[in-house]
């Protein structure tokens, strides 16, 4: 069984922060910026980054900080999946990955985080104020979604810090408790950012490992159908969404797609590009819990058909984990 972590991680591992400003100068504002944006620590983080080398290329990284095996990840843009957003990629731990243009490469970074590279020109090209959303589904306890976008003044090569969606409830007590520190930090951060405005941007090296601490308590799932429970979206930019998504690579894919609930993916028209990428083994994720793994910090492996964990495995999802956490 999972042991509760006393201090949940506020952010995913950041890319290396070496550059023109120097390590010491950059780390503090970066940490402060992350704190300012992620107060309340929802279950999902989203990080959007524009590549310094290719200005039309974006990298979206998303991670699930909650407990439970991930059943499905959906990445969309233009708003939350199922609420006006257009699906860019769907990643299933065992059935594979499906993506649509302008998504170039979707992949699992760890068993609880994914990355998606977008590139394009013209109608299919994302732009700086596009909203990107990631939805993580985990049976039987539900779905969580968060959204993020590049700040309008982002320099190429700088990534937007993990951004919780406004539809996720903030822990008001937690926010109030650290508000003084955050207020000071944010003011200091703005001061540093102003100073940094005309300096060359540092090159950030993406981290390939994602150790994550177990999460604290619960957050409301993002459900379009349960909109009454959540703060409505304030700003969703749609000006950069493509007119069509018909430029995906014409590869056939595994047959599992047909068995996905159609509402889970909001399938766009056109052929799909597939990659059956296995998930890399996790390094130090310790927040999963289920009936078969008694030691704190253990996560069930993604097993093959040889290990039947359900009494009635009539579908592919049945092999993903024990009953309490699929």
């Amino acid at each position: 069984m999972r042991t509760e972590a006393q201090v949940p991680a506020l952010q995913p591992p950041e890319p290396g922060l070496e550059g023109a400003m120097g390590h010491r100068t950059l780390v503090l504002p970066w940490v402060l910026l992350t704190l300012c944006v992620t107060a309340g620590t929802p279950e999902v983080w989203v990080q959007v980054r524009m590549e310094a080398t290719e200005l039309s290329s974006f990298t979206i990284r998303c991670g699930f900080l909650g407990s439970g095996s991930i059943s499905l990840v959906t990445v969309s843009w233009g708003g939350p999946n199922g609420a006006g957003g257009t699906t860019l990629a769907v990643l299933h731990p065992e059935r594979g990955i499906r993506q649509w243009a302008p998504a170039r490469q979707a992949r699992w970074e760890t068993q609880s985080s994914i990355s998606l590279i977008l590139e394009g020109s013209g109608a299919s090209s994302p732009c700086a104020n596009t909203t990107f959303c990631c939805k993580f589904a985990s049976f039987p306890e539900g779905s969580w979604e968060a959204c993020g976008s590049l700040p309008p003044s982002s320099d190429p090569g700088l990534s937007a810090p993990p951004t919780p969606a406004p539809i996720l409830r903030a822990d008001l007590a937690g926010i109030l408790g650290v508000s003084g520190v955050l207020l000071f930090g944010c003011v200091y951060l703005l001061h540093l950012l102003r100073r940094h405005k005309h300096r060359p941007a540092p090159r950030l090296q993406p981290s390939r490992t994602s150790p994550q601490a177990p999460r604290a308590r619960a957050w409301a799932p993002s459900q379009a159908s349960q909109a009454a429970l959540h703060v409505p979206y304030a700003t969703i930019n749609t000006s950069c969404r493509p007119a069509t998504l018909d430029t995906a690579h014409p590869h056939g894919g595994p047959s599992w797609w047909a068995s996905l609930p159609t509402h889970a993916a909001h399938r766009p028209q056109g052929p799909a590009a597939w990659a059956s990428t296995p998930i890399p083994a996790r390094g130090s994720f310790v927040s999963v819990e289920n009936g078969l793994y008694a030691q704190a910090g253990e996560r069930p492996p993604h097993t093959g058909p040889g290990l039947t964990l359900f009494p009635d495995p009539r579908g592919p999802r049945a092999m993903e984990g024990p009953l309490g956490v699929r």
């Epitope: 509760e4 407990s67 049976f139 306890e141 799932p221 349960q226 289920n290 009936g291 579908g315 309490g324």
Partner: antibody
Framework: EVKLVESGGGLVKPGGSLKVSCAAS????????MSWVRQTPDKRLEWVAC???????YYPDSVKGRFTISRDNGRNIVNLQMSSLRSEDAAMYYC?????????????WGQGTLVTVSA | ENVLTQFPAIMSVFLGERVTMSCRAS?????MYWYQQKSDASPKLWIY???NLAPGVPARFSGSGSGNSYSLTISSMEGEDAATYYC?????????FGGGTKLEIK
């Protein structure tokens, strides 16, 4: 409006079989996991079975091998076939709908159907 | 099996009084769910994901907790709150319920 109506309860002898059904309306039935929960005469609640949107099924050990949950998405019905019934299976059986496609927790409940197991 | 123990089993409180009932799990759980049941009625989802109120639940209700210990609180008891409250977990199989706390008006 979400509506769940159970039927099929009744008196059955120990070792006998019974099928209870739940007719659902007011929502897209195939989009939600469905469960059966029972309440014993001493008012204790016990989860009995769940079927998800992919028709994977889940049971506690206490009913595994004896109870079978199934769904008919065309007719918006979820069934619970019970066999080898024991006295401890006597209860009010509730049909419950999940919150969304991946959230099995019991967001909506029917009015229940009473199953009595007695010689 | 993760055994959920609710206490007290019965509470008698005055109207306007603050009420807190507890649910302890034999093993740590990720989230706790609470249901309200009035006599001769079906249970209703009351709190999900530990602290989120289901639609229609009055704001005087709140939920909290982590690990093995969870609680449901009513800031000011009202007559319509008299009912039995059950906690439940989905973290491990089988999904289990607590024995219930019956809340009565004194």
């Amino acid at each position: 409006e979400v509506k769940l109506v159970e039927s099929g309860g009744g008196l059955v002898k120990p070792g006998g079989s019974l099928k209870v059904s739940c007719a659902a309306s007011g929502f897209t039935f195939s989009d939600y996991p469905m469960s059966w929960v029972r309440q014993t005469p001493d008012k204790r609640l016990e989860w009995v079975a769940c079927i998800d949107t992919d028709e994977n099924t889940y049971y506690p050990d206490s009913v595994k091998g004896r109870f079978t949950i199934s769904r008919d998405n065309g007719r918006n019905i979820v069934n619970l076939q019970m066999s080898s019934l024991r006295s401890e299976d006597a209860a009010m059986y509730y049909c419950a709908r999940g919150w969304d496609d991946y959230a099995a927790w019991f967001a909506y409940w029917g009015q229940g159907t009473l199953v009595t197991v007695s010689a | 099996e993760n055994v959920l123990t609710q206490f007290p089993a019965i509470m008698s409180v005055f109207l306007g009084e603050r009420v807190t009932m507890s649910c302890r799990a034999s093993s740590s759980v990720n989230y706790m769910y609470w249901y309200q049941q009035k006599s001769d009625a079906s249970p209703k989802l009351w709190i999900y994901h530990t602290s989120n109120l289901a639609p229609g639940v009055p704001a005087r209700f709140s939920g909290s907790g982590s690990g093995n210990s969870y609680s449901l609180t009513i800031s000011s008891m009202e007559g319509e709150d008299a009912a039995t409250y059950y906690c439940q977990q989905f973290t491990s199989s089988p999904w289990t319920f607590g024995g219930g706390t019956k809340l009565e008006i004194k």
